[in-house]
Structure formats: structure tokens, C-alpha cells
């Protein structure tokens, strides 16, 4: 019961243009190009997109026209390879153009940069933005797509269209408001934060598919959809998983037109069949397409069906477990995961996958044993420590978060993770630890039943950021090991890391701890990042420093910044008091 159109089209580009409409077609091609060629100027991309769009229109008019039968990869790859400055700007990526499809596209994918060397996006004054919006709305919105796509090369393209729609709505409303800034800025902050979260979530999906394969992604999807749609039967969940896997495989593979088209089809199917999927879909299904797809992706879990019997009967107590497993492995394990997940909305997806893996490993071992039933009879007992480990970790960390507040909780994690993997770059440690620390305000407010799925699945997303950033420039075998051995055990792997005893402390460099008056004009967030950067550097210099020592130095540092920012001659204060602070810190830490 696949929802996707399988019929052959003479012209793939014409087919997608007709399905998506000109506006979405152009937006998606722009996203695709910006995600591949992240350094190219906006104007160059717009020119390429216009050329592709004009060509697509000729194919709509006559599908038999020259080159209209070519694959989208061939058409888009050929277009990207016309960029004159490819070698100068991208170096070895230019070598991709010597390859034939599908190797050429694979080559472009491999050169996507998760941390491109691009300037930070600075938000202009509200009046400047509103003028730009009114002067040329189309260009203004294209620029938004371009800037997000090039900085987030795995951003979920159809979802970026939804963000752009909200971005446009914010400017349409707020640029007419009496107090433009009060109206617009909170909306832009919300879009920025949601956008970063959306990007990180999608990056994990792509990493799952690309590094661990389709089976790993499907297992994740079975668990998540079974939690979300516990009243849906297994065949329905399996069908949704197959279709969702296709959508994400396409988007992660750069096939953005197919991805957006198939996502729309999937949303249509879900809404047409909501009676057999979930009672929570009604409101989503009344919305326009982009909002509908987003809403379905975020929809709350349906209530568990009544009368679910114990799983033990079919999966532990039955003497026929090995026969069923041997003769229908994938169905049997899939059914186990589905049944377990729909009964446990209180578990994280990664925990459910750990349990399923433990179950599979036990059957592999026991079904070869002399008395299989006796061997697997206690398999559910093996689940207990696996369940208790994240429960205890979340309890401890939520207590710490409630005690410290977000900033100091982030600092505790900064110290913890710097000691675990001190070789990792300071900006990466700061970024990742700050995000890890956000788990507190995001999840600790929830009741017990919602804490684990919120916290552990969020941590999986954040640790994946560490993994993809580290993969670009690997510096730590421990990070590589935790990132590559098992997708579902990444968080327990990092949690289990102790202080790296092999690390040789970094040489002390006073310049690292020299601050200037410009810190005073920074936002509170930026100031925190400066302080947290200093904290990481301190730990790298003195990994054996105690919590008390680090706290004393950080308190002195905070007092120093506060004092000098109030001084008449700020720069002099920073120079003189800074020297004293460095000396006092060195003494306190025994550097």
C-alpha cells in the first residue's frame, strides 16, 4: 500500500515542477544548490535557479524536448558544475565534476560542510529589514532560504519552506505594527531557536541513515511512530515507516524535489486514513499543506488502546519464540519493538531500541542453546538495568539543574565534558555543552512519564552535533569510538567516560584570558559564551582542578567583568585588573 506514485514520467523535472508548483520548485532548487555550494554568492545561486526553472518550463510544455529526459541529479549536477570559481572556492570538491552520476552526487554529498566558514548572521535594525522586505519581498525571502540552507546543509527542505512561510508572515504582520521591534524580534528569536532545533533533529536522521543504514532508521521510526500512534496496527505503522524512510532518504541524499513531493503525499495519506492511525490528527489535517506536514510531525502521542495484554506471553513465555524468530526474523523483531513502544510512551526511543537490541542478542544466543526456553525465560529481567540507568541519570541531572539554574548547569556540563574529551575544540565543547545544558529547562519541567523521552532523545540530537563536528576534524579516539560503535548507545557511552588521564594539559597562554571593553556591549548570551569559553580553557590547562577551585576562579572572573564594565575607563580597568586576575587564577589553580 505505498502512497508514492510509481508510474514512469518521460520528464522527471517536468513531473516535479507540475506537482510542486513554480514557487515551491524554485525554493527547493535554491535550497538544494545552497546546501551543496555553501560558499557561492546569493546572486549566483539565483541565476542558476532561474536557468533551471526556465528549462523545467520548456519540459512542462514538451516532455520530449532535448535533455528533459535526464535525471534531476544529472541536470542539477551539470548546472552546479558550470560555476566558474568552483576550484578556487571549493578546492577538491571541483573533482566531483569529473565523475559520472550517481558518483558525482555522492561526491557532492560528501563535501557538505556542517561547520562552514561563514560569517555569523547579524540581524539588521528592524526598520532596515522592513524596508528590504517591502522593497523586494521575493528576494528578501529567497535570501532567508539561502542563508539558512548554506549554514545548515542537511536542513529538512520541506520544513524550511514552512519556516520561510512563517518568516514572511512575521514581516507581513509586524512591519505594519505600531511597535515593529516588539512585534518582530520575539518572532524572529522563536524562528531562530526552532530552526536550530529542527536542523539538529534532521541532522541526526541523516546521520542515522548515512552512517548506520536504512535498518537503523527504520527501527527508530517503528519505535517513534508506535509511541505516537499506539492505536494504529502493525501493518499501518510499517507502511508509514517505509514511506517516511523514503522521504528522509531522499532529503538526506539531496533529492529535495522528490522529498517534498513524497512528504506531501504522505501527509495526504495520513489525513485520509486518520481513523486507523490516530485520534490526534484532526486539527493537523484541517491545515494547509506546509502547516499540516509540520503539525503531523509534531503531533502528540495518542492514548494507548485499552486491553493490551502482557507482552511476556508471546515474546518470553512461549516455547515457540525461536521458531517464530527463525522463520520471520524481521517481522518478529519489528512486532516486538512495535508492541513494546506502543505500551511505553514513557521511554525514550533510544532506550526502546536498546531493549530491542538486547532482546535480539538474547534470542541469537539462546536459540542456539540446548534449552532455548530456559535460556531466554529471564530476558525481560535484563531490561531492568537498561531502564533504570537513564531514569537515574535524568533524576540526578534534573536535581542538579533545579539547584543551579541553566547557566551554572551548563558550566557543570562544560567542566564534565572538557575533562572527558579535552582534545575537542573549545568552540565545539562550548556549543555542545550549552545545548546539553538546555535539556534542563526543556525537559525537567515535565512529569516523570514525559521526562525520559524528552531528555534522552534530545541528548541524542545534541551528541550527534558533537559527532558530526568531530568527524570533520577528528582529534579524540574516545569521541570517535562513542560516535561510531552504536547509534543508540552514544549517550551511555559518553556518560560512562571518565576524566581522560592520557591528556597532557594545555600550555598556559595569558592571551586566552585577556579581555577587553567590548565584552560590556555584548548581549547576556554572548557574555556567557565568553565566560564559558574561558572556563573550558581553564579546564584544558588544569584538568585536575576541583569544582571549588573552578568556581572560585569563575566567581572572580564574573566580578572582574562586572567591575570593569562599570568603570569610567573600561579598557584600562580590563588591562590592569585582568593581569591581577590571571595571576590570582594561576595561584589558585597552581598553574
Amino acid at each position: 500500500r505505498g502512497v508514492f506514485r510509481r508510474d514512469a514520467h518521460k520528464s522527471e523535472v517536468a513531473h516535479r515542477f507540475k506537482d510542486l508548483g513554480e514557487e515551491n520548485f524554485k525554493a527547493l532548487v535554491l535550497i538544494a544548490f545552497a546546501q551543496y555550494l555553501q560558499q557561492c554568492p546569493f546572486e549566483d545561486h539565483v541565476k542558476l535557479v532561474n536557468e533551471v526553472t526556465e528549462f523545467a518550463k520548456t519540459c512542462v510544455a514538451d516532455e520530449s524536448a532535448e535533455n528533459c529526459d535526464k535525471s534531476l541529479h544529472t541536470l542539477f549536477g551539470d548546472k552546479l558544475c558550470t560555476v566558474a570559481t568552483l576550484r578556487e572556492t571549493y578546492g577538491e570538491m571541483a573533482d566531483c565534476c569529473a565523475k559520472q552520476e550517481p558518483e558525482r552526487n555522492e561526491c557532492f554529498l560528501q563535501h557538505k560542510d556542517d561547520n562552514p566558514n561563514l560569517p555569523r548572521l547579524v540581524r539588521p535594525e528592524v526598520d532596515v529589514m522592513c524596508t528590504a522586505f517591502h522593497d523586494n519581498e521575493e528576494t528578501f525571502l529567497k535570501k532567508y532560504l539561502y542563508e539558512i540552507a548554506r549554514r545548515h546543509p542537511y536542513f529538512y527542505a520541506p520544513e524550511l519552506l514552512f519556516f520561510a512561510k512563517r518568516y514572511k508572515a512575521a514581516f507581513t504582520e509586524c512591519c505594519q505594527a505600531a511597535d515593529k521591534a516588539a512585534c518582530l524580534l520575539p518572532k524572529l528569536d522563536e524562528l531562530r531557536d526552532e530552526g536550530k532545533a529542527s536542523s539538529a533533529k534532521q541532522r541526526l536522521k541523516c546521520a542515522s541513515l548515512q552512517k548506520f543504514g536504512e535498518r537503523a532508521f527504520k527501527a527508530w521510526a517503528v519505535a517513534r511512530l508506535s509511541q505516537r500512534f499506539p492505536k494504529a496496527e502493525f501493518a499501518e505503522v510499517s507502511k508509514l515507516v517505509t514511506d517516511l524512510t523514503k522521504v528522509h532518504t531522499e532529503c538526506c541524499h539531496g533529492d529535495l524535489l522528490e522529498c517534498a513531493d513524497d512528504r506531501a503525499d504522505l501527509a495526504k495519506y495520513i489525513c485520509e486514513n486518520q481513523d486507523s492511525i490516530s485520534s490526534k490528527l484532526k486539527e493537523c489535517c484541517e491545515k494547509p499543506l506546509l502547516e499540516k506536514s509540520h503539525c503531523i510531525a509534531e503531533v502528540e502521542n495518542d492514548e494507548m488502546p485499552a486491553d493490551l495484554p502482557s507482552l511476556a506471553a508471546d515474546f518470553v513465555e512461549s516455547k515457540d519464540v525461536c521458531k517464530n524468530y527463525a522463520e520471520a526474523k524481521d517481522v518478529f523483531l519489528g512486532m516486538f519493538l512495535y508492541e513494546y513502544a506502543r505500551r511505553h510512551p514513557d521511554y525514550s526511543v533510544v532506550l526502546l531500541l536498546r531493549l530491542a537490541k538486547t532482546y535480539e542478542t538474547t534470542l541469537e544466543k539462546c536459540c542456539a542453546a540446548a534449552d532455548p526456553h530456559e535460556c531466554y525465560a529471564k530476558v525481560f529481567d535484563e531490561f531492568k538495568p537498561l531502564v533504570e540507568e537513564p531514569q537515574n541519570l535524568i533524576k540526578q541531572n534534573c536535581e542538579l539543574f533545579e539547584q543551579l539554574g541553566e547557566y551554572k548547569f551548563q558550566n557543570a556540563l562544560l567542566v564534565r565534558y572538557t575533562k572527558k574529551v579535552p582534545q575537542v575544540s573549545t568552540p565545539t565543547l562550548v556549543e555542545v555543552s550549552r545545548n546539553l545544558g538546555k535539556v534542563g529547562s526543556k525537559c525537567c519541567k515535565h512529569p516523570e512519564a514525559k521526562r525520559m523521552p524528552c531528555a534522552e532523545d534530545y541528548l541524542s540530537v545534541v551528541l550527534n552535533q558533537l559527532c558530526v563536528l568531530h568527524e570533520k576534524t577528528p582529534v579524540s579516539d574516545r569521541v570517535t569510538k562513542c560516535c561510531t560503535e552504536s547509534l543508540v548507545n552514544r549517550r551511555p557511552c559518553f556518560s560512562a567516560l571518565e576524566v581522560d588521564e592520557t591528556y597532557v594539559p594545555k600550555e598556559f597562554n595569558a592571551e586566552t584570558f585577556t579581555f577587553h571593553a567590548d565584552i560590556c556591549t555584548l548581549s547576556e548570551k554572548e557574555r556567557q559564551i565568553k565566560k564559558q569559553t574561558a572556563l573550558v580553557e581553564l579546564v584544558k590547562h588544569k584538568p585536575k582542578a576541583t569544582k571549588e577551585q573552578l568556581k572560585a576562579v569563575m566567581d572572580d572572573f564574573a566580578a572582574f567583568v562586572e567591575k570593569c564594565c562599570k568603570a569610567d575607563d573600561k579598557e584600562t580597568c580590563f588591562a590592569e585588573e585582568g593581569k591581577k586576575l590571571v595571576a590570582a587564577s594561576q595561584a589558585a589553580l597552581g598553574l
Epitope: E233, S276, A313, E317, N324, E327, A328, V331, F332, M335
Partner: antibody
Framework: EVQLVESGGGRVQPGGSLRLSCAAS????????MNWVRQAPGKGLEWIGH???????YYATWAKGRFTISRDNSKNTVYLQMNSLRAEDTATYYC??????????????WGQGTQVTVSS | AFELTQSPSSLSASVGDRVTITCQAS??????LAWYQQKPGQPPKLLIY???DLTSGVPSRFSGSGSGTDFTLTISSLQPEDFATYYC??????????FGGGTKLTVL
């Protein structure tokens, strides 16, 4: 509406064969273990066998050899092929849905049954 | 395969009575026992599963207990619509299942 409808019953001579069908609507048969249960007039319930989500069939000891359960997922139908029928096979034959794909019980959903009479 | 012995095979009682039916398995089936109610000309209706879990929509006067080999169905206060035949079913020990012989509950 979620339901099971049996068909194919009737009168058959001893030694004859009969194929019963159980058509499901409102759900997908492939998600569940599908059972056949019979009840002779004035007697108790007797489980015949089932086919699970892995397409593996299991039978009561007495039913092995003469009875075969199969399914066609495209038609959303499960079948019971009965061969070498005897007078004591006269009964109402029910189709019942297991709780899950590999469940032998409990059975929350039952068909209304189809009557099979074996006599000369 | 295990066997289930249901007792009594027939029972007469009055409206308002407390009624108990037992089911004994020939080997341990943990808590994998269901109870059904059947009225003439109708298929069985699931009342209790996993020995003591009440099926949604079934009145709370029905309750089940037991584990291992000995199980009980109790109707706390008999209602006119409760006169029927009751069956126990053991499941889960293998991919086969067994029904008890039934208990016919009639009006005294």
C-alpha cells in the same frame, strides 16, 4: 467497522473437502495471528489452529494433517482448508483475531461463525 | 499440550448471588488465562485476559484472579443478562491454545 465474516460453510459428505473463508474489514489481517475455533452442537469451544504475522501456521494436535490455514493479505482474507471430513467435524466454525501478530490469545474479535454439516 | 479443567460444568444461581467458577491448568501458564461469556447463537465475548485484567466495556462485577495453575472467575452480584456459558482459555506457553470445557450458568 472492524469485523470478521466467515463464509464457505454448508453440507458435505464424509471424506469430502471444504474451504472456509474469513474476510476481515476495518483492519489488516497481516498485523495479527488469525485463529480458527469450532464448536460442535451443544459442546464447548475447540481451537483448530492459527496463522501468525510471520505466516507460520500452528495447529492443535488433532487437526494436523487434515486442516490447513492460509491467508491472502491482498484480499485481507484467511482460509481454513478441511480435508477428509468426518461426521464429528460437524460444527460452527469461528474465525477469531489474536491480540497481536504472534499471539495465541486472548481473542477479543470473533466472527459470527459459519455452519459445517458432514453427513451422507 | 496442557489441559484446562473447568468446574463446575453447570451451575444454578439467582439474581444478586455471588458466583465463582474455577479453572485448573495441568501445568503452570503463569497469568495467561482469559475468560469468555457465550450466549446461544452468538460467538464468545472476552471478559477477562491475563487472569485478572477486565476487558473495556465489561461490567466491574466480573473479576478474575489466580496464576500458575489455579484461576477463578467471580461474578459479585449476578444480573439477569449474566446467565450464559463461561469458558476459560489458556494461552502463551506455546503457539497453541486450549479452552476449558465450559460452565453453563442457569437460573435457579
Amino acid at each position: 467497522e472492524v469485523q470478521l465474516v466467515e463464509s464457505g460453510g454448508g453440507r458435505v459428505q464424509p471424506g469430502g473437502s471444504l474451504r472456509l473463508s474469513c474476510a476481515a474489514s476495518g483492519f489488516s489481517l497481516s498485523s495479527y495471528a488469525m485463529n480458527w475455533v469450532r464448536q460442535a452442537p451443544g459442546k464447548g469451544l475447540e481451537w483448530i489452529g492459527h496463522i501468525n504475522a510471520g505466516d507460520i501456521a500452528y495447529y492443535a494436535t488433532w487437526a494436523k494433517g487434515r486442516f490447513t490455514i492460509s491467508r491472502d493479505n491482498s484480499k485481507n482474507t484467511v482460509y481454513l482448508q478441511m480435508n477428509s471430513l468426518r461426521a464429528e467435524d460437524t460444527a460452527t466454525y469461528y474465525c477469531a483475531r489474536g491480540a497481536g501478530g504472534f499471539s495465541t490469545g486472548p481473542f477479543k474479535l470473533w466472527g459470527q461463525g459459519t455452519q459445517v454439516t458432514v453427513s451422507s | 499440550a496442557f489441559e484446562l479443567t473447568q468446574s463446575p460444568s453447570s451451575l444454578s444461581a439467582s439474581v444478586g448471588d455471588r458466583v465463582t467458577i474455577t479453572c485448573q491448568a495441568s501445568e503452570s501458564i503463569n497469568s495467561r488465562l482469559a475468560w469468555y461469556q457465550q450466549k446461544p447463537g452468538q460467538p464468545p465475548k472476552l471478559l477477562i485476559y491475563d487472569a485478572s485484567d477486565l476487558t473495556s466495556g465489561v461490567p466491574s462485577r466480573f473479576s478474575g484472579s489466580g496464576s500458575g495453575t489455579d484461576f477463578t472467575l467471580t461474578i459479585s452480584s449476578l444480573q439477569p443478562e449474566d446467565f450464559a456459558t463461561y469458558y476459560c482459555q489458556g494461552y502463551g506457553g506455546s503457539s497453541t491454545t486450549t479452552f476449558g470445557g465450559g460452565t453453563k450458568l442457569t437460573v435457579l
